[in-house]
């Protein structure tokens, strides 16, 4: 899956909160 | 490269329970949700329910709440599938998927499935 | 919970021509924070496992050919095959990821 068009705006992963699904995402994580 | 390689097939009696395994391999285990897919016999694909491995926390069809419980080992990269109460309804092909957590959300890699067969 | 309904549920296809699969949802899939459809697309061959075609209801796979185009936004969306070869046949399947996930019925194509 290649998504390295997609902005990040954060650092990293290590804070994603597992949510149910895309509707529940502020942002879009890299 | 990235591989979700499942456990065995299995058959198994009717109230019995049955564990499905999937071990991951070629990727942080811990950075992408584990979902589980089943499909019965000439029938379409059902999600089951996740696991996000880096803090075991989980989401479940609602059909399934109460018989299924998934589970991660992040020092084996493998994630689990639990079905108990097994019913002839039951027997289907059990997937496990990469799902791309956080961005698209879709499954991009699948384990090659696991036959479970319910019958007395 | 929400509702994925595919047609049609069978698709006969003549190699070379188009086709097209429809996916309604029973509500939104858009996020308007960040702008996406959680919509995927997914074939599965005969004898295999399922794989991913689409996502966010339009951007393509890597590797998948560029035959393959998804489109829509919010509660309708589209699968098209701009020239149908023989090794596209399968069942196909929409999935939402807006809350939690549910597939579609599934698209049964074959050549006619």
């Known amino acids: 899956l290649d998504l390295s068009n997609v902005q990040s705006k954060c650092g990293s992963k290590d804070n994603i909160k597992h949510v149910p699904g895309g509707g529940s995402v502020q942002i879009v994580y890299k | 490269q990235v591989q979700l390689v499942q456990s065995g097939a299995e058959v198994k009696k009717p109230g019995s329970s049955v564990k499905v395994s999937c071990k991951a391999s070629g990727y942080t285990f811990s950075d992408y949700v584990i979902s589980w897919v089943r499909q019965a016999p000439g029938q379409g694909l059902e999600w089951m329910g996740e696991i996000f491995p880096r803090s075991g926390s989980t989401y479940y069809n609602e059909k399934f709440k109460g018989r299924v419980t998934i589970t991660a080992d992040k020092s084996t990269s493998t994630a689990y599938m639990e079905l108990s109460s097994l019913r002839s309804e039951d027997t289907a092909v059990y997937y496990c998927?990469?799902?791309?957590?956080?961005?698209?959300?879709?499954?991009?890699?699948w384990g090659q499935g696991t036959l479970v067969t319910v019958s007395s | 919970d929400i509702v994925m309904t595919q047609s049609p549920l069978s698709l006969p296809v003549t190699p070379g021509e188009p086709a097209s699969i429809s996916c309604k949802s029973s509500q939104s899939l858009l996020n308007s924070r960040t702008r996406k459809n959680y919509l995927a697309w997914y074939l599965q061959k005969p004898g295999q496992s399922p794989q991913l075609l689409i996502y966010w209801a339009s951007t393509r796979e890597s590797g998948v050919p560029d035959r393959f185009t998804g489109s829509g936004s919010g509660t309708d969306f589209t699968l098209k095959i701009s020239r149908v070869e023989a090794e596209d046949v399968g069942v196909y399947y929409c999935?939402?990821?807006?809350?939690?996930?549910?597939f579609g019925q599934g698209t049964k194509v074959e050549i006619k």
């Open positions: 999935k939402q990821s807006f809350y939690l996930r549910t």
């Open positions: 998927a990469r799902d791309y957590y956080g961005t698209s959300f879709a499954m991009d890699y």
